[in-house]
């Protein structure tokens, strides 16, 4: 209708990075920019994804290098983390959130794809990491190895081999395991502290240089107490599981101190593994009963999990696997290991700014049934799996509903702000829920809408529209872009209108009647008034139309509803040659060229396109007859 198609600004970017996957208009004290997501962008050797800021009128885009943002104290994997897959602007302070839903971190032998987002302030400076699903690894452990280095240990090289082999089993790194080693005999020394080395390679290298210090006495209690009171303090981390591994070959010369030492270790929640090396006893034919009892006393209960004995130093190699497995069985404590909570949640797959924080869709949460998490300045709200059961019953738990594929919110005069989330795979047809979140991790689900067609992906895109600008939502639009009709993936956008407290179905938006795939409804944007009639409008993307070139449809708002016939259809081919997937993302909230009219930003594969609004001239004709 009044969008200019002759002089668009086509901002080029990398197709392989999928520059244009997301677009947001941005205002910094009067300067207008486009923020463009490129979720497959490369940073160094890693395909991290990134976000660009692009000047509106002319000039080149600048990469914000958010892909370089690192989280301390985790062993992160940023490759393929899809930074920029979702963008959410906060109009209050012009900050925005850029999410990396496939950001993952190493936990033991697993990679947990919890996702994370970066908050960027209004002048494009990174300000904060938002990662509500990130939990401490079960391998967040401080392990201190207490080595008997007294004269009777022989040959030392076997102890060294054992040490190196067990260290190679440990998941050493930020947010995971730290290892310290103390050696004792008559005295105790730090061989290295917990925070001296941050990789298996470095720890193994250090361990290979530990020499036997000797000593005529074996002060095991002293060694344990030294480890508890000093080794766990120097470089120890708050909240880390404390694990001690004691390796000795004889009764201690200070066994009367063991009671107090073990009591203090218990008080400090130190889990103790104890290894009795019987070489000295066997070489001399001595009964080891008293020694074994002492080592069992040192080991945490139950003995069958924490106590080991080997015939001699050379046999230490035989317990490496068992000891490693026992230590890492701590990982699974009180957990049903066949089930995922937030470990694979992919938080930030979608994002939406609300008054007190941000809503983040987490499609992989709870075994890919999905969830919506909320991060606020006061903390995070992570609803429990059970809170979704009303609409996502237990019998469908293995279906992978993908709740959180998209998130938004509506405002009703009765209930205030209500959150909305889509689950496009629910029971194969898709579902949308409207809910409020509570600080006790429960939800109140007010309403649910179901998709009609299997595989239509109903709920993969949702937009709320306040047509008349009174602060109350008038219309909720739900996309089902894979809706199959007349032999093609045509797509459908459902219209729901707010009546009192409920959204009532009121038909669908009309697309063009072409005979190709379109995926109409892949993106739906509520935009400010484009045609200057004082009603806010809607733009719908159909990125597969015209043989994947793409198109957008403009629908005008009118008197608290939306006109279901498009007022303008803009195809990529009208604007520039070679555009593909035009309409995959849309944003229209700002006047970008200072002409008093709202302009549109549209994403495509490798491009961001700005469409300028033209003024609408209203001609009122009046006819006068003379003589009357």
């Amino acid at each position: 209708f009044n969008m200019d198609t002759r002089k668009p600004r086509v901002i080029p970017g990398s197709r392989t990075a999928f520059f244009g996957y997301t677009v947001q208009q941005h205002d910094i004290s009067g300067n207008k920019w486009l923020v463009v997501g490129a979720p497959l962008e490369t940073n160094g050797y890693q395909k991290t994804g990134d976000v660009y800021k692009c000047p509106v009128i002319h000039g080149n885009c600048t990469k914000l290098n958010l892909g370089r943002v690192t989280l301390s104290n985790v062993s992160e994997r940023k490759d393929n983390m899809r930074l920029g897959l979702s963008l959410a602007t906060n109009p209050k302070d012009n900050s925005f959130l850029a999410c990396s839903p496939l950001w993952s971190h190493e936990c033991g032998s697993s990679y947990y794809t919890t996702g994370m987002c970066s908050r960027v302030n209004s002048n494009f400076r990174f300000s904060k990491t938002v990662a509500p699903a990130l939990q401490r690894c079960q391998t967040y452990m401080d392990i201190v190895i207490v080595l008997d280095g007294s004269n009777s240990i022989y040959p030392w090289v076997e102890v060294q081999h054992f040490l190196i082999n067990i260290l190679k089993k440990f998941y050493i790194g930020p947010g995971q395991i730290q290892v310290g080693v103390v050696q004792y005999g008559e005295d105790v020394v730090h061989e290295f502290h917990l925070n001296d080395y941050r990789s298996v390679k470095d720890v193994v290298e250090a361990a290979s240089h530990i020499e036997q210090r000797g000593g005529t006495e074996t002060r095991t209690a002293f060694g344990i107490e030294f480890a508890r009171s000093e080794a766990f303090q120097k470089g120890g981390r708050k909240g880390a599981k404390k694990v001690m591994i004691v390796i000795t070959d004889g009764e201690s010369h200070d066994s009367p101190d063991l009671e107090k030492v073990i009591q203090q270790s218990e008080r400090d929640n130190v889990t103790r593994y104890a290894v009795a090396v019987l070489g000295y006893y066997n070489r001399r034919g001595i009964n080891p009963e008293t020694f074994l009892n002492e080592i069992k006393y040192i080991a945490s209960d139950p003995d069958d999990k924490h106590f080991f004995n080997v015939t001699d130093e050379a046999a230490l190699k035989d317990i490496v696997d068992a000891l490693g497995d026992r230590i890492f069985s701590l990982e699974g404590t009180n957990k049903n290991e066949t089930s995922f909570g937030l470990e694979m949640s992919q938080t930030g797959f979608s994002s939406h700014v609300v008054e007190d924080g941000v809503l983040l869709g987490a499609v992989g949460a709870y075994d890919w049934n999905g969830a919506v998490l909320k991060e606020t300045s006061a903390g995070k709200v992570i609803p429990l799996r059970e809170s979704y059961l009303k609409e996502f019953p237990e019998e469908l738990k293995n279906h992978g509903a993908y709740l959180g594929y998209t998130v938004t919110s509506v405002v009703s005069s009765r209930q205030g702000r209500v959150y909305v989330a889509g689950a496009p795979r629910f029971n194969h047809t898709g579902k949308v829920i409207l809910f409020t979140m509570h600080n006790n991790r429960s939800l109140t689900i007010h309403q649910a809408m179901r998709g009609q067609q299997i595989g239509s992906y109903f709920g993969s895109e949702i937009t709320s529209v306040d047509i008349d600008g009174d602060g109350v939502t008038d219309v909720l639009l739900v996309g089902a872009p894979m809706y199959f009709n007349e032999g093609r993936e045509r797509g459908k956008v459902y219209v729901y209108e707010l009546r009192q407290n409920l959204f009532v179905y009121n038909g669908t938006l009309k697309d063009s009647h072409s005979y190709q795939n379109a995926r109409f409804g892949s993106s739906i944007a509520s935009v400010r008034d484009l045609n200057q009639d004082s009603y806010n409008d809607v733009v719908v993307g159909a990125p597969l139309e015209d043989n994947h070139a793409g198109a957008i449809y403009i629908f005008h708002g009118f008197r608290g509803s939306i006109l279901k016939t498009p007022k303008q259809r803009i195809t990529a081919s009208e604007l520039a040659t070679g555009l593909q997937y035009f309409g995959c993302s849309i944003h229209g909230q700002l006047d970008l060229n200072e002409d008093g009219l709202i302009d549109l930003a549209v994403g495509a594969l490798g491009n961001a396109v700005i469409l300028w609004s033209r003024p609408v001239v209203q001609i009122n004709a009046s006819l006068h007859f003379e003589p009357s």
């Epitope: 006495e217 209690a221 002293f222 107490e225 009764e251 201690s252 010369h253 200070d254 066994s255 009367p256 101190d257 063991l258 009671e259 107090k260 073990i262 008293t290 009892n293 002492e294 006393y297």
Partner: antibody
């Protein structure tokens, strides 16, 4: 030759204090534990307290807890028993004895004893 | 706390007699039980450690044994210098708390 010599005993009034010393020679106090054992006139042996000289862990009999303090100075190779709030029933000969790994946790050497009399 | 009940509290015997003194622990204990001999006006002297091991310099007529929670000191052939008071002592495992029996006085018949 291993020797333990107690000193510091004497007559004291009820409520008074006394400090006993146990000077060790012929071995390193650092490698052993020192126990104090007492024997009231005509009675049996009663264990009083013990100390690990290098870890400074201490144990006390219930009858003296809170009143007696055992300590050791490894540089002087001497152990001490500080006795406060003394009572008539604390009257006894006080022995110090060595306790260590090499005697399989038995008291293998004893001092000659020092007499403490608590009387008004 | 573990109690050591020693019996008899006294006994009369002649030179050459076989004498047996018993200590019963109130609960199961380790073998860290020792026996001491004390003569009037003297400090106690270690005879047996670890329930059955003879301390150096102690005559072989002294022996110790264990049966469950019962510990026994035996003097196979009583000599004149053996008339004294005998004490058993138990060490609590992994602490330096010790307990003495009440003592057994061996007198000349």
């Amino acid at each position: 030759e291993v020797q333990l010599v107690e000193s510091g005993g004497g007559l004291v009034q009820p409520g008074g204090s006394l400090r006993l010393s146990c000077a060790a020679s012929g071995f390193n106090l650092y490698s052993s534990y020192i126990h104090w054992v007492r024997q009231a006139p005509g009675k049996g042996l009663e264990w009083v307290a013990s100390i690990s000289s290098y870890s400074s862990y201490t144990y006390y009999a219930d009858s003296v807890k809170g009143r007696f303090t055992i300590s050791a100075d490894t540089s002087k190779n001497t152990a001490y028993l500080q006795m406060n709030s003394l009572r008539a029933e604390d009257t006894a000969v006080y022995y110090c004895a060595r306790y260590w790994y090499y005697s399989a946790w038995a008291l293998d050497y004893w001092g000659q004893g020092t007499l403490v009399t608590v009387s008004s | 706390d573990i109690q050591m009940t020693q019996s008899p509290s006294s006994l009369s015997a002649s030179v050459g007699d076989r004498v047996t003194i018993t200590c019963r622990a109130s609960q199961s204990v380790s073998s860290a039980v020792a026996w001491y001999q004390q003569k009037p006006g003297k400090a106690p002297k270690l005879l047996i450690y670890s329930a059955s091991s003879l301390d150096s310099g102690v005559p072989s007529r002294f022996s110790g044994s264990r049966s469950g929670t019962d510990f026994t000191l035996t003097i196979s052939s009583l000599q004149p210098e053996d008339f004294a008071t005998y004490y058993c002592q138990q060490s609590a495992p992994y602490s330096s708390l010790i307990t003495f029996g009440q003592g057994t006085k061996v007198e000349i018949k």
